[in-house]
């Protein structure tokens, strides 16, 4: 038979960042290629990255169209040099992927602090809108556009001299907290997702503190 | 949730102008995207445009693209629609809607994490010839 030498994909998994999504499966191929297809539940399968040596492939086009659906791929291999081969049942050995919803799944990037402000007790926390990789009218969403009012922001802050952390929540892109005057403090944000099951929350951003560059302080 | 209220609807004649308002209240005015839609008798609700959180961001349907004009006020928890070069065919019942970009520009498809957002209960602009 055609497929004496194909073994058929295994581990599949969804990899997905910001929207951002790759679909990575093994083994390496040896005397074989791959071709994957994408699907809705409800809609026809697509074909993409035709006949690879991958393990790997962007479907970001793909489920970028509407992150609210459910996704399945599958993945079929080929005997190299004789991808029309098939297997003994009159098809190539393909296996499925689970399935995977973006809007419910994709991982959360590192956010960043854009800018702090402080005037007198108060300072003002600014967080970064990444954008996403998600598009429409020829423009890229930003993450608060696409998740909207779902999407909350936990900062924490401490003093430069201590180790004591506190927190703060916001459901928009900025906090003002109540500091202590002549005193410097540092930052730290993180993105939720606090209706999530999966995946809630993304890696904390890099610390800024007060007194460095990007902060900006008023005495008043 | 918020909760919106339309105002500055009206009769106007044709090519002339309204500037219609929808005022919110509740928590975090500024993590929603806000767009107007419109809704004429006897035909389904309609997108008219839309507007980022930031305000940084607009979107318009192709039928009043270049007459209409979407703001935002986020200290007055407000939004805006400026409605230029009027035509009889834009008169409807026009409400506006608080939701992620993301499900204002797609419509309501459905799916995880998708609601109707908030709505307004409408402001009536009727244009004559």
């Known amino acids: 038979s055609g497929t004496t030498n194909t073994v058929a994909a295994y581990n599949l998994t969804w990899k997905s960042t910001n929207f951002k999504t790759i679909l990575e499966w093994e083994p390496k191929p040896v005397n074989q290629v791959y071709t994957v297809q994408i699907s809705t539940k409800s809609g026809d399968w697509k074909s993409k990255c035709f006949y690879t040596t991958d393990t790997e492939c962007d479907l970001t086009d793909e489920i970028v169209k509407d992150v609210k659906q459910t996704y399945l791929a599958r993945v079929f291999s080929y005997p190299a040099g004789n991808v029309e081969s098939t297997g003994s049942a009159g098809e190539p050995l393909y296996e499925n992927s689970p399935e995977f919803t973006p809007y419910l799944e994709t991982n959360l990037g590192q956010p960043t602090i854009q800018s702090f402000e402080q005037v007198g007790t108060k300072v003002n926390v600014t967080v970064e809108d990444e954008r996403t990789l998600v598009r429409r009218n020829n423009t890229f969403l930003s993450l608060r556009d696409v998740f909207g009012k779902d999407l909350i922001y936990t900062l924490y802050y401490w003093k430069s001299s201590s180790s004591g952390k506190k927190t703060a929540k916001t459901n928009t892109n900025e906090f003002l907290i109540d500091v202590d005057k002549g005193e410097n403090y540092c930052f730290s944000v993180q993105a939720v997702i606090p209706s999530r099951t999966v995946n809630r929350k993304s890696t904390d951003s890099p610390v800024e503190c007060m007194g460095q560059e990007k902060g900006e302080f008023r005495e008043i | 949730e918020v909760q919106l209220v339309e105002s500055g609807g009206g009769l106007v004649q044709a090519g002339g102008s309204l500037r219609l308002s929808c005022a919110a209240s509740?928590?975090?005015?500024?993590?929603?995207?806000m767009g107007w839609f419109r809704q004429a008798p006897g035909k389904e609700r309609e997108f008219v445009a839309a507007?980022?959180?930031?305000?940084?961001?607009?979107y318009y349907a192709d039928s009043v693209r270049g007459r209409f004009t979407i703001s935002r006020d986020n200290t007055k928890n407000t939004v805006y629609l400026q409605m230029n070069s009027l035509k009889p065919e834009d008169t409807a019942v026009y409400y506006c809607?608080?939701?992620?970009?993301?499900?204002?520009?797609?419509?309501?498809?459905?799916?995880?994490?998708?609601?109707?957002?908030?709505w307004g209960q409408g402001t009536q602009v009727t244009v004559s010839s």
């Open positions: 509740g928590r975090a005015f500024s993590a929603y995207a």
């Open positions: 507007i980022s959180w930031s305000g940084g961001s607009t």
């Open positions: 809607n608080a939701d992620s970009l993301l499900s204002l520009l797609d419509g309501s498809r459905g799916g995880p994490g998708t609601d109707s957002g908030s």
